[in-house]
């Protein structure tokens, strides 16, 4: 059953006398494996034999019989899916039909494939789109229908017979579908290359040429222009003639339409080849091209600069920056259109001419007021001199100057007093819009440039102002030179250096802070009692008495201070000891009684000792001793000792009593 | 080495009197430089100073608020000891009652610690 | 007269050193130099590490410093050990009408 054997190669193989012919091939026969193989050249069938006559290329049989002619001619297949055949080398007479006689254990096929050798290697087909245009990339591919693994060759791509140096891309194809060699080369063509020559050659594996195709570009570009000009520089004088003539060098496909532009701007009725300028002005100075069209679009000459030469025109004076800033630097332009340029300028400030300034910039380092003023100047070139313009106005701006603060009152100034001053300058660019003083405080500007300062504080010393337009200019401070009474009086320790005690040595100092004017006598005083008046106190051995709040003055021309009280301090050891008891100095045994050591002491007593009549030491540290329950044993005479930070003091002796109870005396 | 040993009931019934005793080796219950004192610790209440007693020309004694008139102390000569005497105990008595002695002049100066005590008896009150 | 103030409970890793305080009035720890401090290990009697606010008794290691500020005693003790693990009461005479001795809450220090 035929329909169970099914074929998959190319329909005819192409190659030429020598080379070679791969045949990829798959089949699938269902019925079971493939037993005999034989490959036919030109098969015809014999009805009386039921078999195939031709010539027997390549067989495989059970028992390997294998002809001579399998040597050049291969089955590279298998039993079951792959019939692939190789013949190397191939003749011209191997051309014709291929005939694959295949056999399993039940079923045989005959399967025919075309082979076409021609005797020289056949030529390559390049293959173009069907439109190519100036810079734009283009494909071109070259192809030939051969391809075989034995048999190696080579596509090279030709420009007039020139290898290409763009780099081509070679494929390769050996299956079931399609057998071939291409090469694809990517080419961005320029007008230039139109109508030239593009070939693409088969070589061998060595590079040995075996056949060709060629074709003839046909690349479309806009038209190509040459533009001539009379006078050849192009400079011409004002009334002079000018001629223009436009060429096209290349167009495809042919122009159409003619056009002259004068600086990117068409020129209305111009429309021919020639362009003829009569009596030209320094209007029609500018860049000159002509345009020509066709389909694919307009194409433009190179620009013809045209000079139409004359003498300056009335200048202009640019300055670069007005107002400017006194200790700025600020540079003058001159601006006069001339062809050519002027090479020669004349200056003027405030109409006098400016010796030694010929350049068209003129530039000032460092501005100062007298150069405020009116600039103009004059341009001058071969073909004459022109006209000074109207000319700029520079102002220089600066601060105030000379600025000076001036006092309106009497001399001397005291503490409390009223002060006007005034701000006073020479002369401001912009004008003075304010005033600033130094130091800042709550004060009064009755008008424009004055202070009022009421009240004046001791230690207003100096003060400047400032007079401001865009900058404020200080003046050098004024000493208000203010008188005051004493300032910061107090006492001071001088000796001892530590705290004070009893006996000791002690000298205390009035200090004060500033006092103006210097001289100035002092006061001491305790409780309101005068005691001295030199700057220190001194006493030769202080005692407790002379402990509390001493005070001095310190007084001038303008008044007297007072410090605050400070408080003298003696420390002393305890003294004036004495016991105290409670409920009395006579209590019945088993009650309580409380012995209290009473004291005085500066620092206070910080520990106390107790003793009895023995001289004995009781456990106790505290101010009072308390005995509950009191016994008749306690009866004695009791004395304490008093503790502090400079030293001891201990009372007399102080007796207690203690009496029987009526209890106890009735038990006796 | 001076030592405390205590001796005395650890169980008392409400409302009795609690005696507990303590006997001193290795110093004099005389001695003027020394107090000797009792204390007590319980769960509820810490440590707790009760008295002291202590001979300089007489004796002395002191008693915390918290126990006065119902607490005394008492010293026998004789035998270097001293005794805490605690009247109408309740449960709230129950603790450890330790002895200690308290060396009042370290050297020249005063001095304020309990530097030796009593091994502890644990007193419990119930009925 | 109410207790001095301790910390319930202070704890250190070995070799740290950890600070117990003990806050009381003018009239006990503030008004006088007699602060001691004792160590209580548990079903023994207490025993003195520190009197007289920073001094130590013969035998007590110097790891147990004492120190006073204004009515706050505290002690430290440096360079902790296994055996310092216990229960620490501060003791102060005290000028009140009813007692002559006053002690601290105490504070059990565990040793991590």
């Known amino acids: 059953d035929s329909s169970k054997w099914v074929f998959e190669h190319p329909e005819t193989l192409y190659a030429w006398e020598g080379a070679c012919v791969w045949i990829p091939c798959t089949y699938r026969a269902l019925d079971g494996d493939l037993e005999s193989f034989i490959l036919f050249h030109n098969p015809e069938y014999n009805k009386n034999t039921s078999k195939f006559d031709g010539t027997r290329l390549y067989e495989s049989t059970k028992d390997g019989k294998v002809p001579s002619e399998q040597k050049r001619v291969q089955f590279l297949g298998d039993k079951n899916k792959n019939c692939t055949l190789s013949i190397h080398p191939v003749h011209l007479n191997d051309s014709g039909q291929l005939g694959l006689r295949m056999e399993s254990k039940t079923e045989k096929w005959m399967e025919r494939i075309h082979l076409n050798v021609s005797e020289r290697p056949f030529p390559p087909h390049i293959q173009l789109p069907p439109e190519i245009q100036e810079s734009q990339e283009v494909t071109l591919t070259c192809l030939l229908n051969f391809s075989c693994y034995g048999y190696p060759i080579q596509l090279q791509w030709l420009l007039e017979g020139v290898p290409m140096r763009q780099a081509a891309v070679t494929s390769t194809s050996l299956t079931i579908k399609s057998v071939f060699t291409r090469s694809e080369l990517k080419f961005s063509p320029q007008w230039s290359h139109h109508g030239k020559i593009v070939t693409c050659q088969l070589q061998d594996a060595d590079g040995k040429f075996l056949s060709n195709d060629t074709v003839q570009l046909n690349v479309k570009h806009t038209p190509k222009l040459e533009i001539k000009v009379t006078p050849s520089d192009a400079i011409v004088r004002e009334g002079d003639s000018v001629t223009m003539t436009c060429e096209v060098s290349s167009s495809n496909p042919e122009y159409t339409t003619v056009s002259w532009l004068k600086d990117g701007t068409s020129l209305k009725k111009q429309n021919t080849f020639t362009l003829n300028l009569r009596e030209v002005t320094k209007d029609q100075s500018g860049k000159y091209c002509c345009q020509v069209s066709n389909d694919v679009g307009p194409g433009r000459s190179e620009e013809v600069f045209l000079q139409v030469q004359y003498a300056p025109e009335p200048s202009t004076v640019q300055i670069l920056h007005s107002p400017a800033v006194e200790g700025s630097q600020v540079e003058f332009l001159c601006m006069s259109l001339a062809n050519p340029l002027p090479t020669n300028y004349t200056w003027y400030h405030n109409g006098k001419e400016m010796q030694g300034r010929t350049e068209e910039k003129v530039h000032i380092p460092k501005i100062l007021p007298w150069h405020a003023g009116t600039y103009s100047c004059v341009a001058e070139n071969i073909l004459g001199t022109g006209q000074r313009g109207p000319g700029a106005e520079l102002d220089v701006q600066y601060p105030p100057k000379k600025v000076t603060t001036v006092i309106q009152n009497p001399m001397p100034i005291r503490e409390g007093d009223t002060v006007t001053l005034s701000c006073n300058y020479n002369s401001s660019n912009p004008s003075v819009t304010r005033y600033e003083w130094k130091p800042h405080g709550a004060w009064e500007e009755p008008s424009l440039g004055v202070l009022k300062i009421q009240n004046v504080g001791w230690d207003n010393t100096t003060i400047a102002c400032a007079a401001c337009n865009s900058w404020c200019s200080w003046a050098s401070p004024v000493a208000l030179n203010v008188q005051y009474a004493p300032r910061d009086v107090r006492v001071r320790k001088i000796k001892p250096l530590s705290e004070i005690h009893s006996g000791n040595s002690v000298s205390l100092q009035c200090d004060f802070s500033s006092s103006h004017p210097k001289e100035v006598q002092f006061f001491w005083e305790k409780n309101g009692r005068l005691l001295g008046k030199e700057s220190q106190l001194n006493f030769d051995s202080i005692s407790p008495e002379d402990a509390g709040s001493y005070s001095c003055w310190v007084n001038n021309s303008i008044g007297q201070t007072a410090s605050k009280a400070w408080t003298l301090e003696v420390l002393y050891a305890p003294r004036r000891l004495r016991v105290s008891m409670s409920p009395g100095d006579q209590v019945m045994e088993g009650k309580s009684a409380t012995l209290t050591c009473e004291s005085d002491a500066n620092p206070p007593v910080s520990h106390y000792t107790w003793f009895d009549w023995n001289n004995q030491s009781l456990p106790y540290h505290s101010q009072k001793l308390r005995l509950e329950p009191v016994k008749v044993q306690h009866s004695g005479a009791y004395w304490c000792q008093g503790t502090n930070s400079v030293g001891k003091g201990r009372s007399p002796l102080s007796t207690l009593t203690v009496y029987y109870s009526p209890e106890t005396i009735g038990r006796r | 080495e001076v030592q405390l040993q205590q001796s005395g009931p650890g169980l008392v019934k409400p409302s009795q009197t609690l005696s507990l005793t303590c006997a001193i080796s290795g110093d004099s219950v005389l001695s003027n430089s020394d107090t000797w004192n009792w204390i007590r610790q319980s769960p509820s209440r810490g440590l707790e100073w009760l008295g002291r007693t202590y001979h300089r020309s007489t004796w002395y004694d002191d008693y915390a608020s918290s126990v006065r008139g119902r607490v005394s102390i008492n010293v026998d000569t004789s035998k270097n000891q001293y005794s805490l005497q605690l009247n109408a105990v309740t449960p709230e008595d129950t603790g450890v009652y330790y002895c200690?002695?308290?060396?009042?002049?370290?050297?020249?100066?005063?001095?304020?610690?309990?530097?030796?005590w009593g091994q502890g008896t644990m007193v419990t009150v119930s009925s | 007269q109410s207790a001095l103030t301790q910390p319930a409970s202070v704890s250190g890793s070995p070799g740290q050193s950890i600070t117990i305080s003990c806050t009381g009035t003018?009239?006990?720890?503030?008004?006088?130099?007699?602060v001691s401090w004792y160590q209580q290990h548990p079903g023994k009697a207490p025993k003195l590490m520190i009197y007289d606010v920073s001094n130590r008794p013969s035998g007590v290691s110097n790891r147990f410093s004492g120190s006073k500020s204004g009515n706050t005693a505290s002690l430290t003790i440096s360079g902790l050990q296994a055996e310092d693990e216990a229960d620490y009461y501060c003791?102060?005479?005290?000028?009140?009408?009813?007692?002559?001795?006053?002690f601290g809450t105490g504070t059990k220090v565990t040793v991590l």
């Open positions: 003018s009239s006990d720890v503030g008004g006088y130099n007699y």
């Open positions: 200690a002695r308290d060396r009042l002049q370290d050297g020249n100066s005063w001095s304020d610690a309990f530097d030796v």
């Open positions: 003791s102060s005479y005290t000028s009140s009408s009813t007692l002559v001795y006053v």
